[in-house]
Interface confidence: medium
C-alpha cells in the first residue's frame, strides 16, 4: 500500500516566493523619473522576476527630523497622488504582486523614529496601519527598529492591527543588528513577524561559517517562518564580491523561508562601479543610457537589457531560481537538513514527503573542491541517492539535466550546484 501523503502546511502568499524592495523610487526608475505612475509601468518586469511582493518606499510626507511635518497618511506629491497609488495597487493585484508599504517615519532624517517623541510617532503608525489597510495594501515594513524604544511591544501592537484586519497581511521589521540574541528577543514576542537583519552580512568568508550561521538561526527560531537577506535595505554588492553573487542567489532562494532582495540584486547592481552614486540607492541600470554621467561607464552586461538577452547572466539565474522556488513543494515548504561536505563547502537537502527532492552544494572558496558528502549526517527520511540530476550551476559550462555521481562531485571556485532527485520509498 502506498504511504499516506503528508498534510500540506498552510501557506501564506509570502511563503511562496521572493520579496523585492524598492526603497527609492527615483533611483529605481532613473532619468529624473521616480513616481508611482512610472512604477506601474515596471510591474511587467517584476512579474518576469516571479517575485511575490513589492516592498515599496517609504513614500509618505516627511520633512527631515520634523514630527509635525511627517504625515504617514499622505503621499509625498513628488511620488504622486493617492489615486496613482490606488492604480498601482490595482495593476499589481492583477499581476499577482502584493504591495507592502514601508512606514518608517523619519526616513529622510537622522533618527528614523524621532527618538524623543516615540509615543507620538507610535500613535501615528497605528493610525496609518488602519488607513492603508483599508486602502488595500498587503502589508507593512518598518526599518531601523533598533532605534525604537520598546520595539517589541510596539511591534506586537502593530502586528495585532495588521493580523486583525486579515491573516493574509504581513508585517516586516528591519534591523541593522547582526546579533542573534537581539534578533531572537525581537522575534520572541512577535509570532509571524518577518524580520530582516544584518545577521548574514558577514557570512561571505567560508562555507563552514555560513553553514554555522544558517543552522544556528534555524535551530534557534525553531519551526517559525523566517526571511533571508543580508540586510534590511542594502544591495548584496554592499557585502559581497561579484564572484559570490550567484552563490548567494542560489542559497537565498533555496533556504527555508522568504528570500528578500533589493532592486538591482538580480543584476548585481553595484554603487561602487557608478561614480557619484549613493551606496544605499544607486540608479537602476535598465540599459546603457541609465547612467549618462560618465560615458562608457556602463556596459551592456551590467544592465537589465543586456542581461535579459544572455541566458548565462545573473538576471537569468535569478529568474530561473525564482521560478523553481515558487513551484517546487520541496523548496516552498520542505524540510531542511544541512550536512558535511568538506572544508569550504556548505551543503543541504530540501525535501517534502514524496515530492522531488533538492540537493544544494555551495563552494564559498576560491579553489576548486571535491565534495565529500557525508550522508551519515542525514536522517533516514532524507537519504542521498548515488546520482542526482543537475538542475543548474551558478557557473557556465555544465551540462544541465545530466546525472552527476554524488561521490565524485567536483565544484569550481565559487560554484553552487542545485541538483534534483526523486523520492525513493
Amino acid at each position: 500500500r502506498a504511504p499516506r501523503c503528508r498534510e500540506l502546511p498552510a501557506q501564506k502568499w509570502w511563503h511562496t516566493g521572493a520579496l523585492y524592495r524598492i526603497g527609492d523610487l527615483q533611483a529605481f526608475q532613473g532619468h529624473g523619473a521616480g513616481n508611482l505612475a512610472g512604477l506601474k509601468g515596471r510591474l511587467d518586469y517584476l512579474s518576469s522576476l516571479k517575485v511575490k511582493g513589492l516592498v515599496l518606499g517609504p513614500i509618505h510626507k516627511n520633512q527631515k527630523d520634523d514630527v509635525a511635518q511627517t504625515d504617514l497618511l499622505q503621499i509625498d506629491p513628488n511620488f504622486g497622488s493617492k489615486e496613482d497609488f490606488d492604480s498601482l495597487l490595482q495593476s499589481a493585484k492583477k499581476k499577482s504582486i502584493r504591495v507592502i508599504l514601508d512606514l518608517t517615519p523619519n526616513y529622510r532624517g537622522e533618527n528614523s523614529w524621532f527618538s524623543t517623541q516615540v509615543d507620538t510617532v507610535a500613535t501615528k503608525v497605528k493610525d496609518a496601519l488602519e488607513f492603508w489597510l483599508q486602502a488595500g495594501v498587503d502589508g507593512f515594513q518598518v526599518r531601523d527598529i533598533e532605534n525604537l524604544k520598546d520595539a517589541s511591544s510596539f511591534l506586537a501592537e502593530w502586528q495585532n492591527i495588521t493580523k486583525g484586519f486579515s491573516e493574509d497581511r504581513l508585517l516586516i521589521a528591519g534591523t541593522n543588528s547582526s546579533d542573534l540574541q537581539q534578533i531572537l528577543s525581537l522575534l520572541e514576542s512577535n509570532k509571524d513577524l518577518l524580520l530582516t537583519s544584518s545577521y548574514l552580512s558577514d557570512s561571505g568568508s567560508t562555507g563552514e561559517h555560513t553553514k554555522s550561521l544558517v543552522t544556528q538561526y534555524l535551530n534557534a527560531t525553531g519551526n517559525r517562518w523566517c526571511s533571508w537577506s543580508l540586510s534590511q535595505a542594502r544591495l548584496l554588492t554592499s557585502f559581497l564580491p561579484a564572484q559570490l553573487l550567484r552563490l548567494y542567489q542560489l542559497m537565498l532562494f533555496t533556504l527555508p523561508g522568504t528570500p528578500v532582495f533589493s532592486y538591482g540584486d538580480e543584476i548585481g547592481l553595484d554603487a561602487a562601479a557608478l561614480p557619484g552614486q549613493p551606496m544605499e540607492a544607486p540608479v537602476m541600470l535598465w540599459d546603457e543610457s541609465s547612467f549618462p554621467d560618465i560615458p562608457g561607464a556602463v556596459s551592456a552586461n551590467m544592465t537589465v537589457k543586456g542581461q535579459s538577452e544572455d541566458p548565462g547572466s545573473l538576471l537569468s539565474l535569478f529568474r530561473r531560481l525564482s521560478d523553481q522556488r515558487s513551484k517546487e513543494r520541496s523548496l516552498l515548504h520542505g524540510d531542511f537538513h544541512a550536512f558535511s561536505a568538506g572544508p569550504g563547502l556548505f551543503s543541504y537537502i530540501r525535501h517534502w514527503d514524496q515530492n522531488e527532492r533538492f540537493l544544494v552544494v555551495l563552494n564559498f572558496g576560491d579553489v576548486g573542491l571535491s565534495a565529500g558528502l557525508q550522508a551519515s549526517d542525514l536522517p533516514a527520511s532524507a537519504s542521498l541517492p548515488a546520482k542526482a540530476d543537475l538542475l543548474l550551476s551558478t557557473q557556465p559550462g555544465r551540462e544541465e539535466g545530466s546525472p552527476l555521481e554524488l561521490e565524485r562531485l567536483k565544484l569550481e571556485p565559487h560554484e553552487g550546484l542545485l541538483l534534483r532527485f526523486p523520492y525513493a520509498a
Epitope: 497622488s81 493617492k82 489615486e83 490606488d86 495597487l89 490595482q90 493585484k93 492583477k94 488595500g136
Partner: antibody
C-alpha cells in the same frame, strides 16, 4: 465632506464650443483624479476620461479624444471639461466624479451633473 | 472595449421583496465590478465596489456577488427609497464601461 459642485445648464449652438466646471471641496484636490462621465437622455453612462490635477496628465476614451479637453486649476480646486464642435449627439448630462481612496476603481463621489442642450 | 450587459432593462417588484439585478461582462473582469444607483432626479451614488464591498453609508440590505464575467446586485428587503435605475460598471480595464441600467419600479 467631499463635494463636487458642477456649473449650471448650458444651451449651445451646433459647431460651437463650451466649457463646464467641477469645483472640488472637502479633500486635497491633487490627491485624486477627476473623471468625467456622459449620459444622454434615457441612455446609459459613458466614461469620457480623467485628469490628474497634480500633473495635468489626462487619459481618455478614444471615442472622446477629439471632442473633450480636460484641464484643472490647482489654485481654485476646479476641473474643467471643454467640448468642441458641438452636435445634437453632445446633448447630455455630464458628470464629474472622484474615486474613493479604497482599493477599487469605483466612483464614490459624483457631481450633480451639468445638462448640455445643443440646438439651432 | 469591454461590453457590459444588463439584460433586464426594467423590473417591477413589491415593497419587502428580494430583488436581484444581473450584469455580464464580455470578458473576465477580475471582480472589478461596481454598482451605482441613479435616482429620478439624476443623483448618482456608489452602492457596491469590488463585487461585494458595501460603500460607506449604504444600507446592508444591498449586497453584491459574482466572479469572472457574471455579477449580480441583490436588494433583500425592497424599500420605497430604492426606486431608481441601477448601473453596473467595470473597473478592470480602460476605458471604464457601464451597463445599460435596470430601472426598478414598484408594482
Amino acid at each position: 465632506q467631499v463635494q463636487l459642485q458642477q456649473s449650471g445648464a448650458e444651451l449651445a449652438k451646433p459647431g460651437a464650443s463650451l466649457k463646464m466646471s467641477c469645483k472640488a471641496s472637502g479633500y486635497t484636490f491633487t490627491d485624486y483624479y477627476i473623471h468625467w462621465v456622459k449620459q444622454r437622455p434615457g441612455q446609459d453612462l459613458e466614461w469620457i476620461g480623467y485628469i490628474n490635477p497634480n500633473s495635468a496628465y489626462t487619459d481618455s476614451n478614444q471615442k472622446f479624444k477629439d471632442k473633450a479637453t480636460l484641464t484643472a486649476d490647482k489654485s481654485s480646486n476646479t476641473a474643467y471639461m471643454q467640448l468642441s464642435s458641438l452636435t445634437s449627439e453632445d446633448s447630455a448630462v455630464y458628470y464629474c466624479a472622484r474615486k474613493g481612496h479604497f482599493y477599487a476603481p469605483s466612483f464614490a463621489y459624483w457631481g450633480q451633473g451639468t445638462l448640455v442642450t445643443v440646438s439651432a | 472595449d469591454i461590453q457590459m450587459t444588463q439584460t433586464t432593462s426594467s423590473l417591477s417588484a413589491s415593497l419587502g421583496d428580494r430583488v436581484t439585478i444581473s450584469c455580464r461582462a464580455s470578458q473576465d473582469i477580475s471582480n472589478y465590478l461596481n454598482w451605482y444607483q441613479q435616482k429620478p432626479d439624476g443623483t448618482v451614488k456608489l452602492l457596491i465596489y469590488y463585487t461585494s464591498r458595501l460603500h460607506s453609508g449604504v444600507p446592508s440590505r444591498f449586497s453584491g456577488s459574482g466572479s469572472g464575467a457574471d455579477y449580480s446586485l441583490t436588494i433583500s428587503n425592497l424599500q420605497q427609497e430604492d426606486i431608481a435605475t441601477y448601473f453596473c460598471q467595470q473597473g478592470d480595464t480602460l476605458p471604464y464601461t457601464f451597463g445599460g441600467g435596470t430601472k426598478l419600479e414598484i408594482e
